[in-house]
C-alpha cells in the first residue's frame, strides 16, 4: 500500500465566518520539513505555499483576499515531505457573511428567564431565504439550523445557567452564504440552585479551535525530536 504522512490540521484564523470583501486566513498545520502545502477548494487545487526554510516551521497560512460567495465552501489541505504526500485534512467550511440583509432576533418569553423555563428564539428576515442559523458567542461551531419562509424558530428545552450568553442569528442563502448577523440577544438565566457552582460560563475569548498554532522549531525542539526518534528506534 502507498505510504502517506499523517493528515494535517486545517483551521480558520480568528473565524470561519468571513464578511464579504474581507480577507480570510486559513492555516494548514502539517509537519516540520514539509516542503509544500496545497490548499484545495471543493476538491480542486486552489493555492500552493512553500515554507522557507521548510525544516523550521510546521505549517503555513493561506490568505484569501476579497471574500465572496464564489470563495465560500469546503476547503482542505495536504502537505509533502520529499516525495511523500500526506493524507487530506478534514474539511473546513468557510462561510461568507454580510450578504444582503440583517435579520432580527427575538427570544420568548424574554431575555431574562429562570432555570427550568422553556425558551424559543425567533429569527426573522424579510428577504427570500429558507434557512436560518442560530449561534451562541464563544460556541460558533455549534450552529443550530431551522427553516421557514420569513422567520424560523429555535426551541430550547428547559434552560439552565449553561444556556446563558449572547446569541445571534443569520439568514442563509445557501450553506456558505449568510446574511449580516442580527443584533445579539443576551440570555440571562437565574435561579439554577442545584448546579449554579458547576455551571459553565461562556468564554469571552474566541473559539479555541479558531486559532492558528504554527510554531517555528527551536534547537530544543530539534533535540527533543532527535531524542524521540532514538527512543522509538530503541523500543523497536
Amino acid at each position: 500500500p502507498k505510504q502517506t504522512l499523517p493528515k494535517p490540521i486545517i483551521r480558520a484564523e480568528s473565524t470561519y465566518m468571513v464578511p464579504k470583501e474581507k480577507q480570510a486566513t486559513l492555516c494548514c498545520q502539517g509537519s516540520y520539513g514539509a516542503v509544500e502545502y496545497q490548499l484545495h477548494f471543493e476538491g480542486s487545487l486552489f493555492a500552493v505555499e512553500r515554507p522557507k526554510p521548510p525544516e523550521r516551521i510546521n505549517g503555513v497560512k493561506f490568505h484569501i483576499p476579497d471574500m465572496n460567495s464564489r470563495k465560500a465552501g469546503r476547503y482542505s489541505c495536504i502537505y509533502r515531505v520529499g516525495e511523500l504526500w500526506s493524507e487530506r485534512s478534514d474539511l473546513l467550511d468557510l462561510v461568507v457573511t454580510e450578504m444582503y440583509d440583517t435579520p432580527t432576533l427575538s427570544v420568548h418569553p424574554g431575555p431574562e428567564v429562570t432555570s427550568g423555563e422553556k425558551v424559543t428564539f425567533y429569527c426573522r428576515l424579510d428577504t427570500a431565504t429558507s434557512m436560518f442559523l442560530l449561534l451562541k458567542e464563544g460556541r460558533s461551531r455549534d450552529v443550530q439550523r431551522s427553516y421557514g419562509k420569513v422567520q424560523a424558530e429555535f426551541p430550547m428545552g428547559p434552560v439552565t445557567t449553561a444556556h446563558r450568553g449572547s446569541y445571534r442569528c443569520f439568514g442563509s442563502y445557501n450553506n456558505y452564504a449568510w446574511s449580516f448577523p442580527s443584533e445579539p440577544v443576551k440570555l440571562l438565566v437565574t435561579g439554577d440552585i442545584e448546579n449554579t457552582s458547576l455551571a459553565p460560563t461562556d468564554p469571552t475569548f474566541p473559539d479555541s479551535w479558531d486559532t492558528c498554532l504554527l510554531t517555528r522549531e527551536t534547537g530544543l525542539q530539534k533535540d527533543l525530536a532527535l531524542w524521540d526518534h532514538t527512543a522509538q528506534n530503541l523500543l523497536r
Epitope: T104, P109, T114, G116, E117, Y122, P158
Partner: antibody
Framework: QVQLQQPGAELVKPGASVRLSCKAF????????MHWVKQRPGQGLEWIGM????????KYNEKFKSKATLTVDKSSSTAYMQLSSLTSEDSAVYFC????????WGQGTLVTVSA | DIQMTQSPSSLSASLGERVSLTCRAS??????LNWLQQEPDGTIKRLIY???SLDSGVPKRFSGSRSGSDYSLTISSLESEDFVDYYC?????????FGGGTKLEIK
C-alpha cells in the same frame, strides 16, 4: 405604572372586519411581546397569537391564522389585531397582554357581531 | 397542542381556609407556567409566573409549586377578595394554552 388601554366595546356586522387596538403606557413597548387572548361569554381563555414589536416576529395559534392579523405601530406604542369575516362565533372579549409571560393585561374589548 | 387539565372546576371554601388548585400538563412544560386571577368584571391579573415566582404586589398567601407534571396554586388563608376565577397558563410550547379555570366560591 404599566397600563394597556383597550376600547370597551365594538359592534360589527357579520362578514365585516374590525381592528382592535391596545395602547401601551409605562414600559418600553418595543422590548416585550404582545399577546392577544379571546374569551367567549362564560367561557375560558384562548390564545390567538403574539407579536414582537421590535422584530416584527409574529406567531399565531393555527386556529386563528386565517381570522386574525397582528400588527404594531411603534411610534404610538400601539398593538393592533384585525379580525376578518366576522361571525357570531367571534363575539367575545379580546384581551391584549404585554410581556412574554403575560405580565400585564388590558381590560379587554367586547366585540359583538350582530346584524 | 399541550392540554392543561385544571381541577377542580369549582370549589367552595370558607374564609381562612387553605386551598390548592391543580393543573396537569399533557406534555413536559418545564417551569413555564403562570397562574392568573380573573375578577367578576373581567380584569385579569397574573399572580405567579415560572411555576413558583410571586408577582410583585401579590399577597404572600399565594404560592406556586410543581410535582412532575402537576402544578399547584395554594392560597394559605382565604380572604374575601380571593373568591374569583383562577386559570393556569403554559407558555412552554406554542400554542400557549390555558387550563379550563377554577371558580372559587364562598361557603
Amino acid at each position: 405604572q404599566v397600563q394597556l388601554q383597550q376600547p370597551g366595546a365594538e359592534l360589527v356586522k357579520p362578514g365585516a372586519s374590525v381592528r382592535l387596538s391596545c395602547k401601551a403606557f409605562g414600559y418600553t413597548f418595543t422590548s416585550y411581546w404582545m399577546h392577544w387572548v379571546k374569551q367567549r361569554p362564560g367561557q375560558g381563555l384562548e390564545w390567538i397569537g403574539m407579536i414582537h414589536p421590535n422584530s416584527g416576529v409574529t406567531k399565531y395559534n393555527e386556529k386563528f391564522k386565517s381570522k386574525a392579523t397582528l400588527t404594531v405601530d411603534k411610534s404610538s406604542s400601539t398593538a393592533y389585531m384585525q379580525l376578518s369575516s366576522l361571525t357570531s362565533e367571534d363575539s367575545a372579549v379580546y384581551f391584549c397582554a404585554g410581556d412574554g409571560r403575560f405580565a400585564y393585561w388590558g381590560q379587554g374589548t367586547l366585540v359583538t357581531v350582530s346584524a | 397542542d399541550i392540554q392543561m387539565t385544571q381541577s377542580p372546576s369549582s370549589l367552595s371554601a370558607s374564609l381562612g381556609e387553605r386551598v390548592s388548585l391543580t393543573c396537569r400538563a399533557s406534555q413536559d412544560i418545564g417551569n413555564s407556567l403562570n397562574w392568573l386571577q380573573q375578577e367578576p368584571d373581567g380584569t385579569i391579573k397574573r399572580l405567579i409566573y415560572a411555576t413558583s415566582s410571586l408577582d410583585s404586589g401579590v399577597p404572600k398567601r399565594f404560592s406556586g409549586s410543581r410535582s412532575g407534571s402537576d402544578y399547584s396554586l395554594t392560597i394559605s388563608s382565604l380572604e374575601s377578595e380571593d373568591f374569583v376565577d383562577y386559570y393556569c397558563l403554559q407558555y412552554a410550547s406554542s400554542p400557549w394554552t390555558f387550563g379550563g379555570g377554577t371558580k372559587l366560591e364562598i361557603k
